[in-house]
């Protein structure tokens, strides 16, 4: 009686279950009632990261360096190549299929966290205390300067933007 | 329904070279090897050796390696065996034929090699 | 090579009585697969081989389940269970489990 389902890594075709290529193999013929099923490795720059039955293996993805990228880990004939971004820059999509440029908090906004070579800057206000008057993707908001820890005084407030501006105290006279 | 048709019978010298055609129809062709037997007047079979129409690839029986040349022309669904340097014991009957979901025969061709 | 040798070179039979044939390989025909590569043929007088049975046991579609097969290792056998007239011709054991594949010298099954 032929076959209605196969074990695992089998597959049924013409009433026989066949034996799925191994990954990093493509099928190159149907195993039949005289022969196992025929695979051959991937070629250089090619991979198939699963049990399968393609004809075809996959292309390793290119990390084009014109749009930013470059390769993060090396494919092999059972792996995708996987690219990131250069120094300054980060992907665009979980594929990291093109960079941008790590966003920069502008003043009043410091750097929550840094960007890596998959995810932008995270920027946040700076809160009562603390200020920053950089636009930049590294610098997180700074603490008003204490005055008083200086034996100063406040002489001009700050502001999300500015550090307070210290001076003497008043002598009296 | 799944047909192979071969050429027809060959009369050779020794020496010269011979090419034998099995037409295939009714299925997809490059969906399965072609293999090649050969049988001598009163004898037994003998494999001669396969070919993948999907991308040419042979294997072959030792015995035949040297002389026997296995290729295929899928934008007609045929393959073709080339036997060169003819000799008497190449006097035979060649058969193609194809397996996968059932097996199929050529009905033969005959081959004399006779000085 | 691997060789396969069949016994008897000649079979006659009655109508209506059983045939067996026997087939041995000089090795084993299990593939590491844990198929065992098998065959029989049959060839009526003046016509192309016709198969019968794949994988020892495995019967082709149309064929009479008069015929059967069985055996494992080295040691294969083909039986008919009750021989017909158009049962005449030669039967071939074959073995794709090794390259190159090889098939037996054949029994030529004739009516007494």
């Known amino acids: 009686e032929p076959p209605t389902a196969c074990r695992e890594k089998q597959y049924l075709i013409n009433s026989q279950c066949c034996s799925l290529c191994q990954p990093g193999q493509k099928l190159v013929s149907d195993c039949t009632e005289f022969t196992e099923t025929e695979c051959l490795p991937c070629g250089e720059s090619e991979f198939l990261d699963t049990w399968n039955r393609e004809t075809h293996c996959h292309q390793h993805k290119y990390c084009d360096p014109n749009l930013g990228l470059r390769v993060q880990q090396k494919g092999t004939s059972e792996t995708d190549t996987i690219c990131t971004c250069e120094e300054g820059w980060h992907c665009t999509s979980e594929a990291c299929e093109s960079c941008v440029l790590h966003r920069s908090c502008s003043p009043g906004f410091g750097v929550k966290q840094i960007a890596t070579g998959v995810s932008d800057t995270i920027c946040e206000p700076c809160p009562v205390g603390f200020f920053s008057n950089v636009s930049s993707a590294f610098e997180k908001c700074h603490p008003w300067t204490s005055c008083e820890t200086k034996d100063l005084v406040v002489q001009q407030a700050g502001t999300n933007k500015t550090d307070v501006v210290c001076g003497p105290q008043d002598r009296l006279r | 329904q799944v047909q192979l048709v071969q050429s027809g019978a060959e009369v050779k010298k020794p020496g010269a070279s011979v090419k034998l055609s099995c037409k295939a129809s009714?299925?997809?062709?490059?969906?399965?090897?072609i293999y090649w037997v050969k049988q001598a007047p009163g004898q037994g079979l003998e494999w001669i050796g396969g070919?993948?129409?999907?991308?040419?690839?042979?294997n072959f029986n030792e015995k035949f390696k040297s002389r026997a040349t296995l290729t295929v022309d899928t934008s007609i669904s045929t393959a073709y065996m080339e036997l060169s340097r003819l000799r008497s014991e190449d006097t035979a009957v060649y058969y193609c034929?194809?397996?996968?979901?059932?097996?199929?025969w050529g009905q033969g061709t005959t081959l004399t090699v006779s000085s | 090579d691997v060789v396969m040798t069949q016994s008897p070179l000649s079979l006659p039979v009655t109508l209506g009585d059983p045939a067996s044939i026997s087939c041995r390989s000089s090795?084993?025909?299990?593939?590491?697969?844990?198929?065992?590569?098998l065959h029989w043929y049959q060839q009526r007088p003046g016509q192309s081989p016709n198969h019968l049975i794949y994988?020892?046991?495995n019967r082709f579609s149309g064929v009479p389940d008069r015929f059967s097969g069985s055996g494992s290792g080295t040691d294969f056998t083909l039986k008919i269970s009750r021989v017909e007239a158009e049962d005449v011709g030669v039967y071939f054991c074959?073995?794709?489990?090794?390259?190159?594949?090889?098939f037996g010298g054949g029994t030529k099954l004739e009516i007494k």
């Open positions: 074959s073995q794709t489990t090794h390259v190159p594949w090889t």
């Open positions: 994988q020892v046991s």
């Open positions: 034929t194809r397996h996968g979901n059932g097996v199929y």
């Open positions: 009714g299925y997809t062709f490059i969906s399965y090897y």
């Open positions: 090795q084993s025909l299990l593939h590491s697969n844990g198929n065992t590569y």
């Open positions: 070919i993948n129409p999907r991308n040419g690839g042979t």
